[in-house]
């Protein structure tokens, strides 16, 4: 339901300190200047609501710019604990300590705060994305070595008077950037603690947050063009939806994905795009300024809203989910990637999604609203969309309750 | 300037294995999939897999799917391709190609002699 | 697979003729067509994308038309450097295939 009543203390509608405050591209993510340790050291740190550990770069590596300097800081306190971190691909490895932490375009607050020093890392650093460090503001229980080691945001709420809430924009530039315009360029906003209403238009629409440790949500109905996939909505959901700042694309469950394209491909086939498109191998080009948006279609995902069978949707466009790439050998034309792909562990509303709204991180009320983004890129004919109320019954079924795994639910 | 620089030529023996590289430069590495390919006199080209730099996704032509194996590193922006149980019919070309529309960019050939 | 059909193996021509290269696919690949050059001992160099768009730098003699199963590769005003084997390849489908070939030769 939107979100019209009496604004709580702290949620004034402007915060002008802190919109601007990100930069960066959704293909190497958002990132937002921070300064740890006394005197300040500064730092870009990747903005990731997908993970909970803040984690800088605290070593030479080659992509790295600069990095945090334990030894230069006379408040930094070691905690004599490692943190190992693998992904799927990759994994970064470091130093628990503590130091004192603050962000110049935020709250005009320092914070004691946890911090993971990497001294290895692989595939983790990406060459160019000019960020050194990843802002985890996802909930404890995924924070590594494990739930004990107390995440920024909650350190932040702690120990000063900021709002247990916090929220993003993020702009899409609709073409690529080179390197220089990435560093000129704005990336969006995070305002942390509050809601600034000159970053959408429209109404704010919440849905819950089913469990705090990703930011997990329930996708109750998906839609391309208006057409229901039709699919058990428990798929959706297989085996989680989270969102994701920290990850570009939208990433689907492998039917789901297959199902989508599918229906993609039949709104989209008066040009026949190559196999590898779809897998995200192929750019397609179009001659600069022809690109025919109008051939490809909506997407719309219901999420679950918060009241008893009440749902609202969130609608994206081609111009969201075609990612704009520059290759020299192709610079005549614009080109773009497409950026929904396969997921083996859920649903992963990435920057593809973001990218068309203003999302707001209720954590006081457990809750994410989505309206649409004052910055999202559209064209004269179709707008990014937040709407409802729909009539949705047995939405609670659409979620996956993952098996547990430790020995007391086994069965001997 | 995209530039894909490909390891030096090899003299394997049959049964033996070999790695070829491709070193990847000019361009943001984990943005375009690499391309391996094959040409042997005659035979014209062939594919032989793709690799994703951004998560080590792998794609093969059914036809090589037992005798190649394709790797990254990102932090050196090089892919690697392991070629096993060489035999004669191995003997070819190599070359590393890398996406965007098609195989706008390739690698300056590697080649691979398999002889006792 | 797809195959890609390149009938003649060799065309022989004059510098400053006009000469087409023809390629044929087994099945509708839309305009997922790629061109390449390649001269003797060294790599490909692409040429056509999308069956006739020239990559960036590559001289405006060299054009590309055809949609469906047909396609060609035009050089007018052929100079003696044009001198090489032309290959067509389809990326409509994995896997990517590669026409046999054509030989240029300069009389």
């Known amino acids: 339901e939107t979100d019209e009543e009496p604004e709580e203390p702290g949620r004034r509608g402007s915060f002008v300190e802190m919109v601007d405050n990100l930069r960066g591209k959704s293909g190497q993510g958002y990132y937002v200047e921070m300064t740890v340790g006394s005197p300040p050291q500064t730092l870009n740190i990747l903005v990731d609501t997908g993970s909970s550990n803040f984690a800088v770069g605290a070593a030479p590596h080659p992509f790295l710019h600069r990095y945090y300097q334990r030894q230069l800081s006379s408040t930094y306190r070691d905690l004599r604990k490692g943190v190992y971190v693998p992904y799927t691909q990759g994994k970064w490895e470091g130093e628990l300590g503590t130091d004192l932490v603050s962000i110049p375009h935020g709250p005009n607050v320092t914070v004691r705060a946890n911090i993971a020093a990497i001294t290895e890392s692989d595939k983790f650093f990406i060459n160019g994305s000019n960020w050194e460090g990843i802002l985890g503001l996802a909930y404890a229980e995924i924070a590594r070595p494990d739930d004990s080691l107390e995440p920024f945001f909650d350190s932040l709420v702690k120990q000063t008077h900021v709002p247990n809430l916090f929220s993003l924009q993020l702009c899409g530039a609709g073409f690529p950037l080179n390197q220089s315009e990435v560093l000129a360029s704005v990336g969006g906003s995070m305002i942390i603690g509050g809601i600034d209403h000159s970053l959408y238009t429209g109404s704010l629409w919440y849905t819950p947050i089913r469990r705090e440790w990703y930011y997990e949500v329930i996708i109750v109905r998906v839609e391309i063009n208006g057409q229901d996939l039709k699919m058990d909505c428990k798929e959706y959901n297989y085996d989680k939806s989270i969102v994701d700042s920290g990850t570009t694309n939208l990433r689907l469950p492998k039917k789901v994905f297959e199902a989508a394209v599918k229906s993609i491909k039949a709104a989209s086939s008066t040009e026949k795009f190559p196999d590898g498109f779809w897998l995200g191998e192929q750019l397609v080009c179009w001659q600069a300024g022809t690109t025919p948006w109008n051939i490809f279609p909506v997407i719309s995902l219901y999420l679950m809203g918060e009241v008893t069978n009440q749902s609202f949707r969130i609608t994206i466009l081609p111009q969201q989910y075609l990612r704009p790439v520059e290759d020299v050998a192709t610079s005549q034309d614009d080109c773009y990637k497409f950026a929904i792909s396969q997921s083996s562990t859920g649903t992963v509303m990435g920057a593809v999604i973001m990218e068309g709204f203003y999302v707001v991180f209720d954590r006081a009320r457990k809750r994410i609203g989505f309206a649409v983004s004052a910055c999202h890129v559209h064209d004269e004919f179709r707008t990014a969309a937040v709407e409802g109320p729909f009539v949705t019954l047995d939405m609670e079924d659409c979620g996956y309750n993952i098996p547990q795994t430790d020995e007391s639910t086994l069965m001997t | 300037e995209v530039q894909l620089q490909q390891s030096g030529p090899e003299l394997v023996k049959p049964g033996a294995s070999v790695k070829l590289s491709c070193k990847a430069s000019?361009?943001?590495?984990?943005n375009f999939w690499i391309h391996w390919l094959k040409q042997r006199p005659g035979q014209g080209l062939e594919w032989?897999?793709?690799?994703?730099?951004?998560?080590?996704?792998?794609k093969y032509n059914q036809k090589f799917k037992a005798k190649a194996t394709l790797t990254v590193d990102t932090s050196s922006s090089t892919t690697y391709m392991h070629l096993s149980s060489l035999t004669s019919e191995d003997s070819a070309v190599y070359y590393c190609?890398?996406?965007?529309?098609?195989?706008?960019?390739w690698g300056q050939r590697t080649l691979v002699t398999v002889s006792a | 697979d797809i195959v890609m059909t390149q009938s003649q193996k060799f065309m022989s021509t004059s510098v400053g003729d006009r000469v087409s290269v023809t390629c044929k696919a087994s099945q509708n690949v839309g305009t997922n067509v790629a061109w390449y050059q390649q001269k003797s001992g060294q790599s490909p160099k692409a040429l056509i994308y999308s069956a006739s768009h020239r990559y960036s730098g590559v001289p405006d003699r060299f054009t590309g038309s055809g949609s469906g199963t047909d396609f060609t590769l035009t050089i007018s005003n052929v100079q003696s450097e044009d001198l090489a084997e032309y290959f067509c390849q389809q990326y409509n489908s994995y896997p990517y295939t590669f026409g046999g070939g054509t030989k240029l030769e300069i009389k």
């Open positions: 032989i897999g793709m690799i994703d730099p951004s998560d080590s996704y792998t």
């Open positions: 000019g361009y943001t590495f984990t």
């Open positions: 190609a890398r996406s965007g529309v098609a195989f706008p960019y």
